[in-house]
């Protein structure tokens, strides 16, 4: 069956200043392949978190990530900025052998209002 | 520099009990899952147990119940208690830090088990 | 689970390309490594998540796959790659990892 991707709010508010999570769960982990969170759509979307090792500033996940079973890629913005506004997406990948990895799942989207403090 | 510096191993009785230590330094412990890989004299290696940064445990079937891993973030520490020892379990045992997706990118020196009558 | 095979011996001339490959896992569900190992030495990551090579393992060593074969090249093999060199898998399917048995490589 294929991978789900879901995230669950269509869209959150947050001060500007403060955390939000980005809520986002899978129900498999198959086929073997990162799960990536960007911003914005197309072309121009912007890689936000990688579940692959890197150090991401102001991100970070909720859930341990390093289990084994874990389907839970939701994760926390600090010292959220008006820059951080915008739509999220949870991105499941199949790895590629030779190529790049294939985008295989979406998440719906979580639109980010960034409230003035 | 990533340090994993394994320690407790000795020879022992068939039926007897030991505790396993791998001590590390150079990066966050408490972010990685880590694991236990075996290697009989002159043999191949053999992945034993991995845990979870948050503490969740995974063995090999020929252990399970015989073997438990765990941790202590607090201390950099990674334990291995290896019960009911057999001559089969005759090995050094490595530590290992895993990578993102479970494979492993640094290893300890080893210990050596014996368990000989 | 599942068994990685490998073949147990490789030789090649200083300067000569080295490959040695790794079958048996399910692409679909298993990621591979490649491990090195000296005598009386413990083993050295030299390539993870199929084709990731850690800063200080040289460019010569690259790992490439193609359905369910993995293959570990060494391009200009030097005297000091000598040794044992394990394909390793981990399997999303069981959370287990699997070793194969070894490939000797022999530096004529």
């Known amino acids: 069956t294929e991978v789900k991707v879901t995230q669950p709010e269509k869209s959150v508010s947050v001060a500007a200043g403060d955390s939000t999570i980005l809520n986002c769960t899978v129900t498999s982990l198959l086929p073997v392949g990162p799960i990536r969170w960007y911003r914005g759509v197309g072309q121009s979307r912007l890689l936000i978190y990688s579940f692959t090792g890197e150090h991401f500033p102001r991100i970070r996940n909720v859930s341990d990530t390093t289990k084994r079973n874990n389907m839970d890629f939701s994760i926390r913005i600090s010292n959220v900025t008006p820059e951080d506004a915008g739509t999220y997406y949870c991105v499941k990948f199949q790895r590629g052998s030779s190529e790049p990895d294939t985008e295989i799942q979406s998440g719906g989207g979580t639109e980010v209002y960034v409230l003035a403090k | 520099d990533v340090q994993l510096v394994e320690s407790g191993g000795g020879v022992v009785r068939p039926g007897e009990s030991l505790r396993l230590s791998c001590a590390v330094s150079?990066?966050?412990?408490?972010?990685?899952?880590m694991s236990w890989v075996r290697q009989a004299p002159g043999k191949g290696l053999e992945w034993v147990s991995g845990i979870s940064s948050g503490g969740d445990t995974y063995y090999v079937d020929s252990v399970k119940g015989r073997f438990t891993i765990s941790r202590d973030n607090s201390k950099n520490t990674l334990y291995l208690q290896v019960n009911s020892l057999t001559a089969e379990d005759t090995a050094i045992y490595y530590c290992?830090?895993?990578?993102?997706?479970?494979?492993?990118?640094?290893w300890g020196l080893g210990t050596l088990v014996t368990v000989s009558s | 689970s599942y068994e990685l095979t490998q073949p147990p011996s490789v030789s090649v001339s200083p300067g000569q390309t080295a490959r040695i490959t790794c079958s048996g896992g399910d692409y679909y569900s298993t990621y591979y490594a490649w491990y090195q190992q000296k005598p009386g030495q413990a083993p050295v990551t030299v390539i993870h998540s199929d084709d990731k090579r850690p800063s200080d393992i040289p460019e010569r060593f690259s790992g490439s796959s193609s359905g369910t074969t993995v293959t570990l090249t060494i391009s200009g093999v030097q005297a000091e790659d000598e040794a044992d060199y394990y394909c390793g898998g981990y399997d999303g399917r069981t959370y287990i990892n699997t070793f194969g048995g070894g490939t000797k490589l022999t530096v004529l």
């Open positions: 150079g990066f966050r412990f408490s972010s990685y899952a």
């Open positions: 290992a830090r895993e990578t993102w997706n479970h494979l492993f990118d640094y």
